[in-house]
Interface confidence: low
């Protein structure tokens, strides 16, 4: 297999000559060999931009209350999300919280719980939304 970088096919040997001079392409890091780059190991490390790093960034392991949304590739870190039945508000650093079991009396559920938001309820009469 080959990867295409800047219209230049580059093989998957241990190191590759960087097409950007001193910078190595995403998915690799600077080698001890001048002008060469080492590829990151799939599932172990990644770099998501052209770089001058001497090592790939380590892949993140999902926390115990999370599951993997997409695996770590050589160019992208692991993406984690809350396990089914739990949620964490967007861009929040808090732990995953259990989804609400139902809506308060007089309200009806209009949106299921997702890994990013709790269920959403609206008043039966007014239709005004309310996040639990």
């Amino acid at each position: 297999a080959t990867i295409k970088l800047h219209d230049q096919s580059i093989g998957t040997q241990q190191w590759e000559h960087s097409p950007l001079g001193e910078l190595c392409p995403p998915g690799s890091h600077r080698s001890e060999h001048p002008g060469a780059c080492n590829r990151c190991t799939e599932g172990v490390g990644y770099t998501n931009a052209s770089n001058n790093l001497f090592a790939c960034l380590p892949c993140t392991a999902c926390k115990s209350d999370e599951e993997e949304r997409s695996p770590c590739t050589t160019t992208r870190n692991t993406a984690c999300q809350c396990k089914p039945g739990t949620f964490r508000n967007d861009n929040s650093a808090e732990m995953c919280r259990k989804c609400s079991r139902g809506c308060p009396r007089g309200m009806v559920k209009v949106k299921d719980c997702t890994p990013w938001s709790d269920i959403e309820c609206v008043h039966k009469e007014s239709g005004n939304g309310h996040n639990i």
């Epitope: 993997e68 949304r69 997409s70």
Partner: antibody
Framework: QVQLQESGPGLVKPSETLSLTCTVS????????WSWVRQSPGKGLEWIGS???????NYNPSLKSRVTMTIDKSKKQFPLKIDSVTAADTAMYYC??????????WGQGTLVTVSS | YVLTQPPSASGTPGQRVTISCAGS????????VNWYQQLPATAPKLLIY???QRPSGVPDRFSGSKSGTSASLAISGLQSEDEADYYC???????????FGGGTKLTVL
């Protein structure tokens, strides 16, 4: 609720190109991997390939030379093309969303028959 | 098929049945296993993920386990609506892709 819908011609002639499209609704096409899986009549499931939102592909080695997958984020679609089809490509074709290494949502499938 | 499943299994209502899935170090040995249920003339449905986790809505009669390079699906309190084809699936590192078992047709007698 995420829904996936396969569409495309149900009949393809031998040696021609099979073209299918999967349309995603009720959810984002970004941040996920998307797969195609097929099932020949009376047989088991066979993974065809996967694509991520950035267009990075990963194909079944046995089909790699004939398969092309792309993604259109604006239309929320990911098409599949298989070149030089034969009767062996007759199957039910499913598209699915990959949550990490789990296919959690599947389309209902579309049957493609290869015949002259 | 890369993963080996028995082609058929059967049981009477209320019984417990187990379906096996045998692989190798490059697939089941180093990756998590998912199980899919395919009812007649329908698309596969995720039944068990990450070896032993049930998606919401799947009864706790269904359970999964993994040991070494093999996995198994157990169904207790068998019901007539469990009659379906069951497939195991996992990632295969050497092939760089998804692999499935050949499927097991479960008959409720």
């Amino acid at each position: 609720q995420v829904q996936l819908q396969e569409s495309g011609p149900g009949l393809v002639k031998p040696s021609e190109t099979l073209s299918l499209t999967c349309t995603v609704s009720g959810g984002s096409i970004s941040d996920y991997y998307w797969s195609w899986v097929r099932q020949s009549p009376g047989k088991g499931l066979e993974w065809i390939g996967s694509i991520d939102y950035a267009g990075s592909t990963n194909y079944n080695p046995s089909l790699k030379s004939r398969v092309t997958m792309t993604i259109d984020k604006s239309k929320k679609q990911f098409p599949l093309k298989i070149d030089s089809v034969t009767a062996a490509d007759t199957a039910m074709y499913y598209c699915a969303r990959q949550l990490g290494r789990i296919s959690d949502y599947w389309g209902q499938g579309t049957l493609v028959t290869v015949s002259s | 098929y890369v993963l080996t499943q028995p082609p058929s299994a059967s049981g009477t209502p209320g019984q417990r049945v187990t379906i096996s899935c045998a692989g190798s170090s490059s697939n089941i040995g180093g990756n998590t296993v998912n199980w899919y249920q395919q009812l007649p003339a329908t698309a596969p449905k995720l039944l068990i993920y990450s070896n032993n986790q049930r998606p919401s809505g799947v009864p706790d009669r269904f359970s999964g386990s993994k040991s070494g390079t093999s996995a198994s699906l157990a169904i207790s309190g068998l019901q007539s609506e469990d009659e379906a084809d069951y497939y195991c699936a996992t990632w295969d590192d050497s092939r760089g892709g998804w692999v499935f078992g050949g499927g097991t047709k479960l008959t409720v007698l």
